[in-house]
Interface confidence: low
């Protein structure tokens, strides 16, 4: 008799794939305009990514450190108007892409949270939080809590006010803090409170320091859901060395967790995002006319035109990993194990009960590497096989789909390997 | 705000080199897209090279292609132009220009937000 099926865990829409962030409305189009009727335009490009939400703005009215200027429930007219956002939330809803609506405060000044009258400005959060899902958001971001006094409270609040409306409704909250010991005080009190930081970029990025700060995390969140990103806000390009930007692109997506995506990190796009220095945002490179004053032809190897007709480009291969990481039941979902590696890569396999697993081999390092897998600390549920396929690389010239010795597994420098393997009784 | 400032210029005889230097202040510099431009005598500031963010992308006007190298040392907040094979044509002001929007860098002046004081560069035949 077949072994019984393990039963499938709740998956809420924010477990099914990537979240993309756009902050900033003029940097992501790019023409000058800037403004929700011409974001709708883009919502194809962002079907094409395969992302689940788009974590928006924030596009509400904030003058400059000036909380009564300061109103969440109405939009800055240079974005648009309310129905201007409601035929957003409409066509988005057509292409199953969830609007997520940033509410940080004072996001034009100096302190996020303006620096007194904390009561005022949560209850005007509040206010907006109900505002906001009456008009069918499907969740909010608040980024840089660090600023904010009493931030567990004020998210546990917050949290209620979005789960009593729908289990369906997500808030995610986001710091620059770095630090696990405060990272797990804001998620112990919040229970379903998606959390982005910078807990990743405090890395010396290696093999093994990934791997211990990844193991860490998941060790300390038990089996709470998580998200996986760099920073809070900024793009990938700003926290990695470039020839690790495919290899992170490849963890991200097959971590246990939600991906989430600052615009332009599909193509590396480049930009400042040092912490504490305000920075205004990259402009998107769709083709080689996102280059105002460029004269002759860039490098058409950098936009999003140029990177979709490449099939070994950063685009594709985000296309591709997105694609696999909303379809297949072992990355949906799927228990963790780390392998034991040597301090040049890190590797880790995805499984799921009788469902296809995966093998995920990081070669942090300068040189290439020969690794031998062996699944010495492995439970017996998650063995490995001599041999797996080779489902993508981050390099090109791999014979993809050929199946490849696991003991005798050689890496190029900065590579990253996505193998899979059947289950076997 | 970036504070720019140029060095390394002087005179050269045509088919030397120089190397300029344009040390940047004031903000995060590996944010910034880097130019430099010239300015002869009675002209018109023209383009002359573009460097990216990472240094990863670099861009040149057809006239000193091949003989001038744009590069970037973030660590020192330094972008340099290496000149060779000068010819008298080379002679102007050379500016540094730093663009803070995005990290491409342009070729048209408009494209850069902060400039330095400029350094001149003379070739002698």
């Known amino acids: 008799r077949a072994p019984r099926c393990r039963d499938l865990p709740v998956q809420k829409w924010w477990h099914t794939g990537a979240l993309y962030r756009i902050g900033d409305l003029q940097g992501f189009q790019g023409n000058g305009a800037g403004n929700l009727a011409g974001l709708k335009g883009h919502l194809d490009y962002l079907s094409s990514l395969k992302v689940k939400g788009l974590v928006l703005g924030p596009i509400h009215k904030n003058q400059k450190d000036d909380v009564a200027g300061t109103d969440l429930l109405q939009i800055d007219p240079n974005f648009g108007s309310k129905e201007d956002f409601a035929s957003l939330l409409q066509s988005a809803k057509k292409k199953s892409i969830r609007i997520i609506l940033d509410l940080t405060p004072n996001y034009q000044g100096e302190n996020s949270w303006f620096s007194t009258q904390v009561d005022t400005v949560a209850t005007k959060v509040k206010d907006a939080l109900e505002f906001w899902l009456q008009a069918g958001v499907d969740g909010f971001q608040v980024r840089d809590i660090e600023n904010l006094k009493d931030a567990s409270s004020f998210l546990a609040e917050w949290q209620n006010i979005t789960k009593g409306f729908s289990e369906d409704r997500l808030l995610i909250a986001g710091t620059n803090s770095s630090d696990l010991q405060q990272i797990l005080s804001l998620l112990e009190s919040n229970k379903d409170l998606l959390l982005t930081s910078s807990y990743l970029s405090n890395s010396s990025f290696t093999g093994e320091h990934t791997k211990s700060l990844v193991t860490q995390y998941l060790n300390a969140t038990g089996n709470r859901w998580c998200s996986w990103s760099l920073s809070q806000a900024g793009l990938l390009t700003s926290f990695l060395p470039a020839q690790l930007l495919r290899l992170y692109q490849l963890m991200l997506f097959t971590l246990p967790g939600t991906p989430v995506f600052s615009y332009g990190d599909e193509i590396g796009l480049e930009a400042a995002a040092v912490p504490g220095q305000p920075v205004e945002a990259p402009v998107m490179l769709w083709d080689e006319s996102s280059f105002p004053f460029i004269s002759a032809a860039g490098s058409a190897n950098m936009t999003v035109k140029g990177q979709s007709e490449d099939p070994g480009s950063l685009l594709s291969l985000f296309r591709r990993l997105s694609d696999q990481r909303s379809k297949e039941r072992s990355l949906l979902h799927g228990d963790f194990h780390a392998l034991s590696s040597g301090p040049g890569f890190f590797s880790y396999i995805r499984h799921w009960d009788q469902n296809e697993r995966f093998l995920v081999v990081l070669n942090f390092g300068d040189v290439g590497l020969s690794a031998g897998l062996q699944a010495s600390d492995l439970p017996a549920s998650a063995s490995l096989p001599a041999k797996a396929d080779l489902l993508l690389s981050t390099q090109p010239g791999r014979d993809e789909g050929s199946p490849l010795e696991l003991e005798r597994l050689k890496l190029e420098p900065h590579e990253g390997l996505l193998l899979r393997f059947p289950y076997v009784a | 705000q970036v504070q720019l400032v140029e060095s390394g210029g002087g005179l050269v005889q045509a088919g030397g080199s120089l190397r300029l230097s344009c040390a940047a202040s004031g903000r995060a510099f590996s944010s910034n897209g880097m130019g430099w431009f010239r300015q002869a005598p009675g002209k018109e500031r023209e383009f002359v090279a573009t460097i990216s963010c990472s240094g990863t992308s670099t861009y040149y006007a057809d006239s000193v292609k091949g003989r001038f190298t744009i590069s970037r040392d973030n660590a020192k907040n330094t972008v340099y132009l290496q000149m060779n094979s000068l010819k008298p044509e080379d002679t102007a002001v050379y500016f540094c220009?730093?663009?803070?929007?995005?990290?491409?860098?342009?070729?048209?002046?408009?494209?850069?937000?902060?400039w330095g004081q400029g350094t001149q560069v003379t070739v002698s035949s």
């Open positions: 220009a730093a663009d803070t929007r995005h990290c491409m860098g342009y070729t048209k002046d408009e494209g850069y937000a902060y």
